[in-house]
């Protein structure tokens, strides 16, 4: 008897998902000697165990705890860069500024970046056809719960000055519904974090507005201030020049505002 397979609204598990996770794990432990102790087979088993045979709308943070434990990693708590809707530039930045870290520079973030996955209730199959969409189907799906879990832990680990890169080209520069707005902001620890510094990245070359005065940035400032964390904001008018100056700080053109 052919089994009825749930059709979800989102794309299915990324092709070659297990092989990709394994290859990334091996690569990461090669590049980061401090993580050489990690057993990638155990990591895969824990990752798989979080969602296989479970209803893909019924995933909990608890499901990911074995994986979280295996992926425990110490990053310098004062070198954390959060981002919202501007992942590529954030990653380009930490590739140059090697002492700063986004979530995707940690093992667990690196493993899952840009991947989709889900299983099916009561079968050991991975569903490559479709997975739940956060809006159209359910929020407690394997991918969303994973990022909520790792994002919360990442924010909780932060200390001193925490930086966040925000996309100034979007209608909501700060979006309360983003992972940054709904998870990370609320899990920064006021007893450890002194300041949240927002970097608002401008899109247009001729855009000279002070986007730090944007209503959504003021909303972010209000939320942060109520949590007894100081807030500061900088406009990054020229992201290309900004990156160039991170690479070559001595360049004479890097003394002016970017």
């Amino acid at each position: 008897v052919p089994r009825w397979r749930q059709q979800w609204s989102g794309p299915g598990t990324t092709k070659r998902f297990p092989e990709t996770v394994l290859a990334r794990c091996v690569k990461y432990t090669e590049i980061h000697p401090e993580m050489r102790h990690v057993d990638c087979q155990s990591v895969w088993d824990a990752f798989k165990g979080a969602f296989i045979s479970k209803h893909p709308c019924n995933i909990t943070e608890e499901d990911y705890q074995p994986l979280m434990k295996l992926g425990t990693q110490t990053v310098p708590c004062n070198k954390i860069l959060l981002w919202s809707r501007i992942k590529d530039l954030a990653h380009q930045f930490t590739q140059v500024q090697r002492d700063m870290f986004t979530l995707e520079d940690t093992l667990l973030g690196y493993l899952a970046d840009d991947l989709t996955w889900c299983g099916e209730f009561n079968t050991s199959k991975i569903n490559y056809q479709s997975c739940p969409d956060w809006r159209k189907d359910c929020s407690n799906n394997p991918v969303s719960v994973f990022w909520k879990t790792v994002s919360r832990r990442f924010a909780e680990a932060a200390c001193d000055v925490v930086h966040v890169m925000l996309n100034g080209s979007r209608s909501k520069i700060f979006d309360k519904n983003s992972t940054f707005g709904s998870v990370e902001v609320h899990n920064l620890q006021p007893e450890k974090v002194q300041t949240l510094e927002a970097w608002v990245i401008h899109g247009g070359r001729e855009d000279s507005r002070d986007l730090c005065q944007d209503p959504t940035i003021k909303e972010l400032e209000s939320i942060i201030s109520k949590r007894n964390i100081q807030f500061s904001c900088k406009n990054i008018y020229r992201p290309d020049k900004f990156l160039q100056c991170v690479k070559n700080p001595e360049d004479s053109s890097c003394t002016s505002e970017i």
Partner: antibody
Framework: KVQLQESGPGLVKPSQTLSLTCAVS??????????WSWIRQHPGKGLEWIGY???????YYNPSLKSRVTISVDTSKNQFSLKLSSVTAADTAVYYC????????????WGQGTLVTVSS | QSVLTQPPSVSVSPGQTASITCSGD??????VCWYQQRPGQSPVLIMY???KRPSGIPDRFSGSNSGNTATLTISGTQTMDEADYYC???????????FGGGTQLTVLG
């Protein structure tokens, strides 16, 4: 051109540990980008993947053999090794070492294979 | 019993096209590789990542993979192609790489 050569005893007693070494020449294990694997073939039968190791020491084993398998690497000697414990007659096979890409399955260089017989 | 199913044998006349199939659950979502093994010799990689040929492998060998079936096609089959052929791919249920049971290709004549 990369060459692989298996070595080790051709006869192992039941319940003992099978130990094989694969010497790699014509390329460095430490250069990265490849998994170093063990694969076996029972007499007159198909192939069975046993497991791999990366030069950094990261391993992945066939889950059905995992409890008995250990693969290790010695980058200074440019070789990797297989240990299979508690062997039975069912472990009698030709054992191959091979080099594979990081997505697995694509073993582009193989040793000539060594027959290991498990018998008392 | 392998989770990747291959026909035990396939026969073809010289110059004709031989097709060897490899079937498994969600196979199209994983890379498939193919090996040729002549009697008494080590296997040789003839196809990787579904459709790519290593250097030195003639272009009469081609591959495809979609749905639950991968196919190795040998066009203009020659007597030297007589050998065992194995597919290999990741298997989700076993969480490891598995080989098909193998197909013995016989070139008639």
């Amino acid at each position: 051109k990369v060459q692989l050569q298996e070595s080790g005893p051709g006869l192992v007693k039941p319940s003992q540990t099978l130990s094989l070494t694969c010497a790699v020449s014509g390329g460095s294990i430490s250069s990265g980008g490849y998994y170093w694997s063990w694969i076996r073939q029972h007499p007159g039968k198909g192939l069975e993947w046993i497991g791999y190791i990366y030069y950094s020491g990261s391993t992945y084993y066939n889950p059905s053999l995992k409890s008995r398998v250990t693969i290790s690497v010695d980058t200074s000697k440019n070789q990797f090794s297989l240990k299979l414990s508690s062997v039975t007659a069912a472990d009698t096979a030709v054992y191959y070492c091979a080099r594979g890409g990081v997505m697995g399955g694509d073993f582009d260089y193989w040793g000539q294979g060594t027959l290991v017989t498990v018998s008392s | 019993q392998s989770v990747l199913t291959q026909p035990p044998s396939v026969s073809v006349s010289p110059g004709q096209t031989a097709s060897i199939t490899c079937s498994g659950d969600n196979l199209g979502d994983h890379y498939v590789c193919w090996y040729q093994q002549r009697p008494g010799q080590s296997p040789v990689l003839i196809m990787y990542e579904d459709t790519k040929r290593p250097s030195g492998i003639p272009d009469r060998f081609s591959g495809s993979n979609s749905g639950n079936t991968a196919t190795l096609t040998i066009s203009g089959t020659q007597t030297m192609d007589e050998a065992d052929y194995y597919c290999v791919a990741w298997d989700d249920s076993l969480s490891g790489w598995v080989f098909g049971g193998g197909t013995q290709l016989t070139v008639l004549g």
